[in-house]
């Protein structure tokens, strides 16, 4: 069963101080109707203490007295049952402590009841387990500000419990959020307490509030969505990758090329090879061979794995990535050592060969054909 966490959350405060969450189950305070109840907020160094009941701010009234770290309820009634919280606000953070109040006629002697599950739903006047809504997993709700690139998927969550099971509805900027408010609509998974929007666009920006309610109460939580518009750019390759590698004859090696590209990238792994005993064509450009490329039949094109290598596999390996805007290339060297020589760690440098000036390859007869490089374009 999830631990209880932050109960009330109605405003968007991206700059708020960190909050500490209570991990253990809340303590249970039991009282008979008409009795008085006094509870001390068990938090240290509290500058300011605020109280909530079932997620709603609790202020003093003719039966509720709030003095310092003490809460007093005079002449308790079953309606006072519920999940209470006191929050201590300090200069650097805030901390919340939770406890249950159960006002019922059916107070046992205590000998025959195991109270370890005391945080379960309280017993109301009619004997049924009833519970106002409460958050069951605030960890999934901590990130309130979502800055997301356009075309991405966004998921907002409000995991909650209560009895009867609460309903969940969503507001956008304080108003009912309807399917027709966005192209493609949105998905709500009630069992996961989530709202999902696919392919977000700038018009999706705004505040999204989940309202979780049953007949015993209502709680809400607000997220802010900012949609970052994409600026088209050629692929970006992570610096230092692929990295130089060394292995012994018969060993395995893997080159990795990490690609960042908003537009669909096309990845090629290219190696320098010899043709008719020569590494260069008549025009002085090197012979190259495509070892692997992205596509339907190629899994994980960002990784080039070489198995059972021979000395002939030594040399320079180029990761070439292109999209409709442009391209980028980085390369690494493979050193193949004789069996008896243990491989040392290569200095990891990324080569930038000068001759890669214009990446327009002449290779139209298959993946493993050898071809000459035609003016290969190189981008720093």
């Amino acid at each position: 069963r999830p631990s209880f966490s932050l109960v009330e959350d109605t405003t968007l405060e991206p700059e708020e101080p960190p909050t500490k969450y209570q991990i253990s189950q809340p303590e249970v305070y039991v009282a008979a109707p008409g009795e008085s109840l006094e509870v001390r907020c068990l938090l240290k160094d509290a500058a300011v203490i605020s109280w909530t009941k079932d997620g709603v701010h609790l202020g003093p009234n003719n039966r509720t007295v709030l003095i310092g770290e003490y809460l007093q309820i005079k002449g308790a009634t079953p309606r006072d049952s519920g999940l209470y919280a006191c929050t201590a606000t300090r200069t650097v953070d805030s901390e919340t402590w939770y406890f249950m109040v159960n006002v019922t006629d059916a107070i046992s002697s205590g000998d025959d009841e195991d109270d370890t599950d005391g945080a379960e739903d309280f017993v109301s006047e009619n004997g049924n387990n009833k519970r106002a809504p409460y958050w069951t997993n605030t960890e999934k709700m901590e990130k309130r500000l979502h800055a997301v690139p356009a075309a991405n998927t966004v998921k907002f969550r409000c995991p909650a419990g209560g009895n009867p099971t609460p309903t969940m509805r969503w507001l956008k900027n304080g108003k009912e959020f309807k399917q027709e408010h966005r192209i493609g609509g949105y998905k709500v998974r009630n069992q996961h307490w989530s709202l999902i929007m696919e392919s977000v666009v700038p018009s999706d920006k705004g505040n999204y509030t989940c309202v979780v309610e049953n007949e015993y109460g209502s709680i809400n939580h607000t997220y802010h969505l900012d949609v970052v518009e994409r600026s088209p750019h050629r692929p970006i390759l992570q610096a230092g990758l692929p990295a130089n590698a060394s292995t012994v004859v018969g060993g395995d090696v893997e080159f990795v090329c990490k690609v960042y590209s908003d537009a669909q990238p096309h990845i090629q792994w290219i190696k320098h090879v010899e043709k008719n005993g020569s590494k260069y064509g008549p025009d002085g450009l090197p012979y190259l061979k495509v070892l692997k490329h992205s596509g339907i039949n190629s899994s994980n094109a960002e990784v080039l794995a070489l198995f059972n290598v021979t000395e002939a596999d030594a040399g320079e390996y180029i990761c070439k990535v292109s999209n409709y805007i442009g391209q980028a290339n980085q390369s690494a060297w493979l050193t193949v050592l004789p069996k008896q020589q243990a491989p040392g760690r290569e200095k990891e440098i990324t080569a930038s060969p000068d001759y890669l000036e214009k990446l327009e390859f002449r290779h139209d007869s298959g993946l493993n054909d050898i071809f000459e490089a035609q003016k290969i374009e190189w981008h720093e």
Epitope: T136, N137, T153, K155, R189, Q191, H192, W193, I196
Partner: antibody
Framework: QVQLLESGGGLVQPGGSLRLSCAAS????????MSWVRQAPGKGLEWVSV????????HYADSVKGRFTISRDNSKNTLYLQMNSLRAEDTAVYYC????????????WGQGTLVTVSS | DIQMTQSPSSLSASVGDRVTITCRAS??????LNWYQQKPGKAPKLLIY???NLQSGVPSRFSGSGSGTDFTLTISSLQPEDFAVYYC?????????FGQGTKVEIK
């Protein structure tokens, strides 16, 4: 204990239809979302479709959208997958799987039923 | 759809080795990532859910970490019964895509 048992697989011609069933036992069926996941021979896993416990939510992989329909009969503890306009690339072992509460992790799987689409 | 990329696609290891498999999402998926193990002719088995939670009954040598786009499955000390194919799966978007799998073979 939790058990999921698929049936209804077999050989079908391209363009044909097939209905898969998944009989569930050992848990309160209506409390759980259920999914279909398939695996083509020698290939990886591909998620196909999901349906919420009360049937109020369904979703499909792009590859089957408009051709497959997921449904459930909670009174019979049974999950279904109606497959129409079948193609050769739909050939796979089809698994039904139960989703964990609060998480779309598949904690229980059936043994799978093989669907072969061939002329 | 969100793409999931696993690496390596296969690896050879010995009993007792520490094995690490990585999974990368094409966008931020928070911690909505699960790991499965599959042996030939069998249905997959859930190992880790929500990036780092060990499924009940799974040995503690399996662990998961990561959030956002980069995730890791670690087997601290490989056992004979661990030779299998491992898959990651995202459940952030409505389409719960799987990675292409990593085959762990005996060296």
């Amino acid at each position: 204990q939790v058990q999921l048992l698929e049936s209804g697989g077999g050989l079908v011609q391209p363009g044909g239809s097939l209905r898969l069933s998944c009989a569930a036992s050992g848990f309160t069926f209506s409390d759980y979302a259920m999914s279909w996941v398939r695996q083509a021979p020698g290939k990886g896993l591909e998620w196909v479709s999901v349906i919420e416990g009360d049937g109020s939510y369904t979703h499909y992989a792009d590859s089957v959208k408009g051709r497959f329909t997921i449904s459930r009969d909670n009174s019979k503890n049974t999950l279904y997958l109606q497959m129409n306009s079948l193609r050769a690339e739909d050939t796979a072992v089809y698994y039904c799987a139960r989703e964990k509460t609060y998480s779309s992790a598949f904690d229980y799987w059936g043994q799978g039923t093989l669907v072969t689409v061939s002329s | 759809d969100i793409q999931m990329t696993q690496s390596p696609s296969s690896l050879s290891a010995s009993v007792g080795d520490r094995v690490t498999i990585t999974c990368r999402a094409s966008q931020d998926i928070s911690s909505d990532l699960n790991w499965y193990q599959q042996k030939p002719g069998k249905a997959p088995k859930l190992l880790i859910y929500d990036a780092s939670n060990l499924q009940s009954g799974v040995p503690s040598r399996f662990s998961g970490s990561g959030s956002g786009t980069d995730f890791t499955l670690t087997i601290s000390s490989l056992q004979p019964e661990d030779f299998a194919v491992y898959y990651c799966q995202q459940h952030y978007s409505p389409s719960h895509t799987f990675g292409q799998g990593t085959k762990v073979e005996i060296k």
